[in-house]
């Protein structure tokens, strides 16, 4: 089970619930976006394949002072089995292009919705 205690309940959260909550948070970010998200900050795009959650966290954790994505950063840390620090990039994370945080969130959301529909909760 993905352990995400503290988000919806005090104990371990089923992976399907954790993924649904992450999707809901990303939807919330995209719908409530008035000004450019995180002041137009640019982050490394990621491969939406194996190790996606850690890669997404490695990318977004570098953005500081952006309250809009703080909850997403915390949620992603629950999906990633190792501790991630700013400036840390795993060998799986190929740095080839930077995109705005808003585009990053949209791309991630589309992919997570697809995974949810297909029942891939881990």
């Amino acid at each position: 089970l993905t352990c995400l205690g503290g988000f919806a309940s005090p104990g371990p959260v089923p992976p399907s619930t954790a993924l649904r909550e992450l999707i809901e948070e990303l939807v919330n970010i995209t719908q409530n976006q008035k000004a450019p998200l995180c002041n137009g900050s640019m982050v490394w795009s990621i491969n939406l394949t194996a190790g996606m959650y850690c890669a997404a966290l490695e990318s977004l954790i570098n953005v500081s002072g952006c309250s809009a994505i703080e909850k997403t950063q915390r949620m992603l840390s629950g999906f990633c089995p190792h501790k991630v620090s700013a400036g840390q990039f795993s060998s799986l994370h190929v740095r080839d292009t930077k995109i705005e945080v808003a585009q990053f969130v949209k791309d991630l959301l589309l992919h997570l919705k697809k995974l949810f529909r297909e029942g891939q909760f881990n």
């Epitope: 450019p36 995180c38 002041n39 137009g40 900050s41 640019m42 982050v43 570098n62 953005v63 500081s64 002072g65 952006c66």
Partner: nanobody, 116 residues
Framework: EVQLLESGGGLVQPGGSLRLSCAAS????????MDWVRQAPGKGLEWVST????????WYADSVKGRFTISRDNSKNTLYLQMNSLRAKDTAVYYC?????????WGQGTLVTVSS
Amino acid sequence: EVQLLESGGGLVQPGGSLRLSCAASGFTFDREEMDWVRQAPGKGLEWVSTISPSGRKTWYADSVKGRFTISRDNSKNTLYLQMNSLRAKDTAVYYCAKAYTGFRYWGQGTLVTVSS
């Protein structure tokens, strides 16, 4: 207070060259990853290039790879972008940016116009 001041833009013919500079102050420059970002008229932001704090690692957008070179002089707190073989599609306002901070820490930009 973080300040970034770009310079070096101008009008250049296709195939020509320009060197952009960005003077940084108000933060520990040699600890920060730095970006060049551009915005073409009526378009969104486009990432151009990134350089690591030491300057040893560099990354480029496919659209500029092999033509642009990013560099930095940490002793002068200055970031550079050498632009060669310029094309009309490179016309844009170029901004230097402290990575991951967004435009609250950008300078006013420098306009590069590539036209014959």
